[in-house]
């Protein structure tokens, strides 16, 4: 679809409000360190320029591509070299290399201060004084901290953020109304960011085919009544949307996502019976709702899979004619019958089936060769089932905090070279699988748990990629997307690791720990636990438990003391000495 002016076309199709919001998100995701005011200025300049192109598409520079226009604008930032270092070299390149260069410099862990929530009255005053600036600031702060956040979904979060302030700033008890809503948005936002990060990693590191396979499996589980052709069409459209967003093409992405939501709702009769409620909602809510919709019921009397994929004499002929289509049909048929399997398990089964056909269709007797292919699936299915059973039992026994601690120890022993903050963050998130998934019945546990673990392990992979320190992490992250979790599960204690030097400063605590929230206090204790394991990787569970129990008692005691700081200083020395003795340091 060629247009005289791409920027005018997008501005008219999206409207001024969406255009400005999406350009702000795009710029903040690229230049994560730039001050808010600088970004607003850049966005306003781009918007004014776009309006001149709307008025006259033949005006100067209106024929330039969006990447050229946006890249040129980003490259006008005066402090690019000082603030971003080698990212400034991107500006010497031509499109499309310049945009690729910007994408490569997106930072998953930018060095930005933690967002501190002001008092409710302060926030409400700011909201009432200038609602537009207040909401722009929200987009900016989230986008720069989450450079792969799904832009059209961020518009939805901003809409909810605005609604929360509109409602709660008029309430009798503003804080009671607002704070739970902000907590919910923060937690949902982190989860949304992590899920999208996996989609982008899948596309960028493993290619479109890998993403499409994931989408076929997931959409087939969700829409088991839809025909294969319908699922294929949805997969193609969804792949385009996510390719655009992950590539920084946020205007196209948002518009195409809206088109996809419209298509799904206009064709819901041939897609799913569960879409009715979603399709009655406004656009942003509708798109979100469709993305989260529950699986439709499986059609009754689905025939056995073996007939078409094992028993048929045409298996190799059908495979040879169109390999990816045939494998796609296999994945579709298997997934629609198995909402109880994780997507990654379904992809492992499809990969096993593909490998078997590659080998057997070249054999003397292909049918004899692949006749038992479904038997190869059994151990692949049982491995995650057993793992989830064991870990849910452990979670129920320990509770979330202690379950997280067990995982902290487990993962620190596997990959002790990884930075302590990363190990704490990832292990805490791995531990949340318990409360998230173990409450579900058996039929829902695996898709919940293993697909969630894929998202969390991707966080480890992208953080580790920035500063690689462990060959084992690199290997598990890069060899196979669907086997990441089994790869990490299979890692034993790293025997090559040289224990970290003991540093008393690491285990010195102060009275400020007493004023921290329960979550922050847990993080402090879990940070200490990781450091302990790094000093003494061969420490037993019992030894570590004893030290951690002593540590908890020490914190509790000193936080009750009159002179807290003195208590932390004196009792802290004793604790360090006792811990060293207990661990034989």
């Amino acid at each position: 679809d060629a247009h005289k002016s791409e920027v005018a076309h997008r501005f008219k199709d999206l409207g001024e409000e969406n255009f400005k919001a999406l350009v702000l998100i795009a710029f903040a995701q690229y230049l994560q360190q730039c001050p808010f005011e600088d970004h607003v200025k850049l966005v306003n300049e781009v918007t004014e320029f776009a309006k001149t192109c709307v008025a006259d598409e033949s005006a100067e520079n209106c024929d330039k591509s969006l990447h050229t226009l946006f890249g040129d604008k980003l490259c006008t930032v005066a402090t690019l070299r000082e603030t971003y270092g080698e990212m400034a070299d991107c500006c010497a390149k031509q499109e499309p290399e310049r945009n690729e260069c910007f994408l490569q410099h997106k930072d998953d862990n930018p060095n930005l201060p933690r967002l501190v929530r002001p008092e409710v009255d302060v926030m409400c005053t700011a909201f009432h004084d200038n609602e537009e600036t207040f909401l722009k600031k929200y987009l900016y702060e989230i986008a720069r901290r989450h450079p792969y956040f799904y832009a059209p979904e961020l518009l939805f979060f901003a809409k909810r953020y605005k609604a929360a302030f509109t409602e709660c700033c008029q309430a009798a008890d503003k804080a009671a109304c607002l704070l739970p809503k902000l907590d919910e948005l923060r937690d949902e936002g982190k989860a949304s960011s992590a899920k999208q990060r996996l989609k982008c990693a899948s596309l960028q590191k493993f290619g479109e085919r890998a993403f499409k396979a994931w989408a076929v499996a997931r959409l087939s589980q969700r829409f088991p009544k839809a025909e294969f052709a319908e699922v294929s069409k949805l997969v193609t459209d969804l792949t385009k949307v996510h390719t655009e967003c992950c590539h920084g093409d946020l205007l196209e992405c948002a518009d195409d996502r809206a088109d996809l939501a419209k298509y799904i709702c206009e064709n819901q009769d041939s897609i799913s019976s569960k879409l009715k409620e979603c399709c009655e909602k406004p656009l942003l809510e509708k798109s979100h709702c469709i993305a989260e919709v529950e699986n439709d019921e499986m059609p009754a009397d689905l025939p056995s899979l073996a007939a078409d994929f094992v028993e048929s004499k045409d298996v190799c002929k059908n495979y040879a004619e169109a390999k990816d289509v045939f494998l796609g049909m296999f994945l579709y048929e298997y997934a629609r019958r198995h909402p109880d399997y994780s997507v990654v398990l379904l992809l492992r089964l499809a990969k096993t089936y593909e490998t078997t056909l590659e080998k057997c269709c070249a054999a003397a007797d292909p049918h004899e060769c692949y006749a038992k292919v479904f038997d190869e699936f059994k151990p692949l299915v049982e491995e995650p089932q057993n793992l989830i059973k064991q870990n849910c039992e452990l979670f129920e026994q320990l509770g979330e905090y202690k379950f997280q601690n067990a995982l902290l120890v487990r993962y620190t022993k596997k990959v002790p070279q990884v930075s302590t903050p990363t190990l704490v963050e990832v292990s805490r998130n791995l531990g949340k699988v318990g409360s998230k998934c173990c409450k579900h019945p058996e039929a829902k546990r695996m898709p919940c748990a293993e697909d969630y673990l894929s998202v969390v392990l991707n966080q480890l992979c992208v953080l580790h990629e920035k500063t690689p320190v462990s060959d084992r992490v690199t290997k598990c992250c890069t060899e196979s997307l669907v086997n990441r979790r089994p790869c990490f599960s299979a890692l034993e204690v790293d025997e090559t690791y040289v224990p970290k030097e003991f540093n008393a400063e690491t285990f010195t605590f102060h009275a400020d720990i007493c004023t921290l929230s329960e979550k922050e206090r847990q993080i402090k204790k879990q940070t200490a636990l990781v450091e302990l394991v790094k000093h003494k990787p061969k420490a037993t569970k019992e030894q570590l438990k004893a030290v951690m129990d002593d540590f908890a008692a020490f914190v509790e005691k000193c936080c009750k003391a009159d002179d807290k700081e003195t208590c932390f200083a004196e009792e802290g020395k004793k604790l360090v000495a006792a811990s060293q003795a207990a661990l034989g340091l």
Epitope: G15, T166, D259, P282
Partner: nanobody
């Protein structure tokens, strides 16, 4: 939720004028971009004009540019469409719509009125 009610339609001779109004009730009118769309018999619904929530940006379909003017009065919660130099091909049901953004595409509008009939005779 926003409720939209159009008025001002009617029968007019070619070359004449009409002013359509759209009264909004419910959620804050000023929080929405607004648009006018129309649908002639046996034809697809088509975009006419849009106005941003601040009122600072307006955009028109080529077929009405220079003849129609969209405006809004946030104090009165009302959207207007001033239609001059009307032509027989302007005959249609005119719909007012509210949405997140001042787009020319109907998919970005979440709330719609019931429509008001405009008939231009030659």
């Amino acid at each position: 939720e926003v409720q939209l009610v159009e008025s001002g339609g009617g029968l007019v001779q070619a070359g004449g004028s009409l002013r359509l109004s759209c009264a909004a009730s419910g959620r804050a009118f000023s929080s929405y971009a607004m648009g006018w769309f129309r649908q002639a018999p046996r034809k697809e619904r088509e975009f006419v004009a849009t106005i941003s929530l601040s009122g600072g940006y307006t955009y028109y379909a080529d077929s009405v540019k220079g003849r129609f003017t969209i405006s809004r009065d946030n104090a009165k919660n009302t959207l207007y469409l001033q239609m001059n130099s009307l032509k027989p091909e302007d005959t249609a049901v005119y719909y007012c719509a509210a949405g997140e953004s001042s787009s020319r595409q109907d998919k970005w509008y979440d709330y719609w009125g019931q429509g008001t009939q405009v008939t231009v005779s030659s």
